[in-house]
């Protein structure tokens, strides 16, 4: 028998520095977690103690903090090289800055293979990107070889900016021939490493003949056997065992997100490459694990540029950006309009001739807006200003909801109107009229939404049974501010970009902004 240790991360999302337990900015260092310096300590400890170790990443290193905003992926290549990753799969967020934003900082700089079998380049891009990412890689590990085959969510064109010269194929269809090829090369230990979410990970384990282990990402799935060490609730045991269609027991793993855990899986193979046993657990990277001093020093060196960036001008406003609680928790506010416009703009994807865009709607809890920006400061807007407006370090996510769920959400928005509570919704691509003289739960008298399947966008009444795409803060997707109906009834949820980054990118793009209050939210006569 031959034993392999798989160490794995996924959805790190730019958490190079240690974070608080909830993966936001580290406040009390003695209780902080994760970060590449601490990860390196644990990885090195395992490498010293065990003979056959692979360190793998299942995608979405890009996007999530000011590190990515400033360094645009160069930080990912640098620190993953320093940690000596063995392989990485492409995630959807790796395409956030377009293909060029993937090629230059990461693909050309990485000293480890970057993989995806279901992304096919065409046209002029095919020769430019050739060899920079691979469908699979055979890695020598001790006296043996292990095949790693990559995959990426086929939804990436809707979630990021891969452009028109990359085709995202069905994962299972694309993986099978690559696995077959590895088999003909006498590689009998094969890991599928990819970024399509836990449901797809399980399907790959079930359907792709010859895959021995699946290491996944995208869904931030936490698996654990026994008593979990922090607040994440396990979605199942680690590893999660899937019985394949040809009768094999295939372990599937994922390690939550944000570099909080290091996945640790031990696999025992027989001489024919069959999995005999698999066991392990994610390792919580808490403060009992010291940060490696050399990596930490490097982080501190790279950090300097971030502090300078915070005070640089991103763009200008020629109007007062009203982010006061007096406005945003009671009525339409132009700061809410600005943020929602930025959220929609960040999700412009012309993927189908029938649609001007795949999503037109945004909702945003007024309580999430925490500061105005005064135009009398020469109109200057900085990252620092935006961090005061959006201080909680969230993401703007894409969800799919039925019209009936949206109606409930808008009723919830005003169910206790007048108490300066945070659930009052700011909107984009939506016209809503409330009648506050009616009883709570029956106050939405008009709800029109901007069409997507149209060449000239116009507002149509919301249909209860139709499924709509909506951009919203992850806080709302998770049921925050009492929006339990969103959490309970959402049909799909894909995590998006860092909130401040979305707004800062929009302001930089527009250069000068002047958002207005324009009648997106109205109160019918006699009620307000």
């Amino acid at each position: 028998a031959w034993e392999l240790t798989i160490l794995h991360t996924n959805d790190v999302h730019s958490r190079l520095e240690q974070t608080s337990e909830d993966s936001s900015k580290c406040v009390n260092a003695s209780r902080c977690m994760g970060g590449v310096a601490r990860l390196f300590t644990k990885v090195q400890q395992i490498r010293r103690a065990e003979p056959n170790v692979l360190l793998l990443d299942a995608g979405d290193q890009y996007q999530g903090t000011i590190w990515f905003t400033v360094y645009k992926g160069a930080e990912v290549a640098h620190f993953m090289n320093a940690l000596r990753y063995d392989a990485m799969a492409l995630g959807n967020h790796e395409f956030d800055n377009g293909v060029e934003g993937l090629i230059e900082p990461l693909l050309k700089e990485a000293k480890f293979p970057i993989l995806s079998a279901n992304i096919k380049a065409k046209g002029p891009l095919a020769s430019q990107i050739s060899g920079l990412y691979l469908p699979y890689k055979v890695l020598p590990v001790g006296d043996e070889v292990v095949g790693i085959v990559g995959y990426t969510s086929k939804e990436t064109p809707f979630l990021s900016n891969p452009g028109t010269n990359l085709v995202f194929e069905d994962e299972i269809t694309a993986l099978q021939p690559e696995v077959d090829k590895l088999k003909t090369l006498n590689v009998n230990k094969i890991i599928a490493l990819g970024h399509s979410g836990f449901e797809m990970d399980k399907l790959i384990a079930q359907k792709v003949r010859g895959v021995d282990v699946v290491v996944g990402g995208h869904s931030n799935t936490f698996l654990y056997t026994g008593n979990p060490p922090s607040k994440e609730v396990p979605a199942g045991k680690y590893p999660f065992i899937v019985t394949s269609d040809d009768g094999r027991k295939v372990p599937v793993v994922q390690a939550y997100a944000f570099g909080k855990y290091l996945g640790y899986l031990k696999i025992e193979f027989d001489e024919r490459g069959n999995v005999i046993s698999s066991h392990g657990n994610p390792i919580l990277l808490n403060s009992s694990i010291p940060e490696d001093p050399s990596i930490k020093a490097d982080i501190n060196k790279w950090r300097i540029k971030l502090d300078n960036y915070s005070t640089q001008e991103l763009g200008k406003t020629i109007v007062y950006l009203d982010g006061s609680s007096q406005s945003c928790r009671f009525r339409e506010c132009n700061m809410g309009n600005l943020i929602c416009d930025a959220m929609i703009n960040n999700n412009l994807r012309h993927t189908d001739e029938m649609f001007w865009n795949h999503v037109s709607m945004c909702i945003l809890n007024g309580g999430g807006i925490r500061s105005p920006i005064d135009e009398r400061n020469n109109g200057t807007i900085t990252w620092e200003n935006l961090a005061a407006v959006l201080p909680f370090g969230g993401t703007f996510d894409l969800v799919q909801l039925k019209g009936s769920t949206l109606k409930k959400a808008f009723e919830h928005s005003v169910h206790r109107y007048g108490q300066s509570t945070g659930e009052f919704l700011q909107v984009g691509g939506i016209h809503v009229v409330y009648d506050l003289s009616r009883k709570p739960g029956d106050r939405v008298v008009k709800l029109d939404v901007l069409c997507t399947k149209c060449r000239v966008p116009s507002y149509d009444p919301l249909k209860m049974d139709e499924v709509y795409k909506v951009i919203l803060p992850n806080f709302l997707a998770n049921g925050g501010d009492g929006f339990q109906m969103i959490k309970d009834e959402l049909l799909r949820h894909d995590s998006g970009d860092q909130d401040i980054n979305v707004v800062s990118t929009y302001i930089s793009k527009m250069k000068v902004i002047y958002p207005a209050v324009e009648g997106r939210i109205k109160f019918s006569t006699g009620s307000h």
Epitope: D22, V27, N28, S324, S325, Q326, R329, R370, S371, P372, A387, A388, P391, F392, R416, Q419, S420, G479, G480, G482, Q484
Partner: antibody, heavy 116, light 105 residues
């Protein structure tokens, strides 16, 4: 994150007192702030809240018209002006960030004793 | 909105499963939090939004309920869990329950 209350002490019925809460380690100006009190050997009683930008204030019925909450975001400070104090206002007074939410932090409290 | 907690005191042993209930005088959706307080200390948030575990709180604590009836469960009591527990609604101006004192049997 640190919240440090001060200004407590002994005061006669009908008298006044001003409590302060000094905040550090977080973006004070981004958080709604509360005062909560606890009479000796008794349970918790919410007193007042002020929104992050100072534009909204709410009070418990038991203190309405007598207590005033205020803040100075430039100084990272929260205040509670207490007038017309009564014996039943005797309590440990805590300042806290957005209670019952993810960003929930409390100070260690300051004791106010109203007695003749 | 009044909050009624029960029981007002409770004796239990290490390893026991303990349940504390809280009833609101009217529907409060999931606007409910649970706090733990030890003598001479500030309250510590355990659960918010009825069932969401606060950062750093052990997973043996869990919350459930919606509307008017809510429950705090400690799956296996540890020595450090003996304290007073309060529920608190934030649907309207905040209001705390009267507290449940959890003592060693």
């Amino acid at each position: 994150v640190q919240l440090v209350e001060s200004g407590g002490g002994l005061v006669q019925p009908g008298g006044s007192l001003r409590l302060s809460c000094a905040a550090s380690g977080f973006t004070f100006s981004s958080y709604d702030m509360h005062w909560v009190r606890q009479a000796p050997g008794k349970g918790l009683e919410w007193v007042a809240v002020m929104s992050y930008d100072g534009s909204n204030k709410y009070y418990a019925d038991s203190v309405k018209g007598r207590f005033t909450i205020s803040r100075d975001n430039s100084k990272n400070a929260l205040y509670l002006q207490m007038n017309s104090l009564r014996a039943e206002d005797t309590a440990v007074y805590y300042c806290a960030t957005e209670i019952a939410a993810k960003g929930d932090y409390w100070g260690q409290g300051t004791l106010v004793t109203v007695s003749s | 909105i009044q909050m009624t907690q029960s029981p007002s005191s409770l004796s239990a042993s290490v390893g026991d499963r303990v349940t504390i209930t809280c009833r609101a005088s009217q529907g409060i959706s999931n606007y409910l939090a649970w706090y733990q307080q030890k003598p001479g200390k500030a309250p510590k948030l355990l659960i918010y939004a009825a069932s969401t575990l606060q950062s750093g709180v052990p997973s043996r604590f869990s919350g459930s309920g919606s509307g008017t009836d809510f429950t705090l469960t400690i799956s296996s009591l540890q020595p450090e869990d003996f304290a007073t527990y309060y529920c608190q609604q934030s649907y309207s101006t905040p209001h705390f329950g009267q507290g449940t004192r959890l003592e060693i049997k």
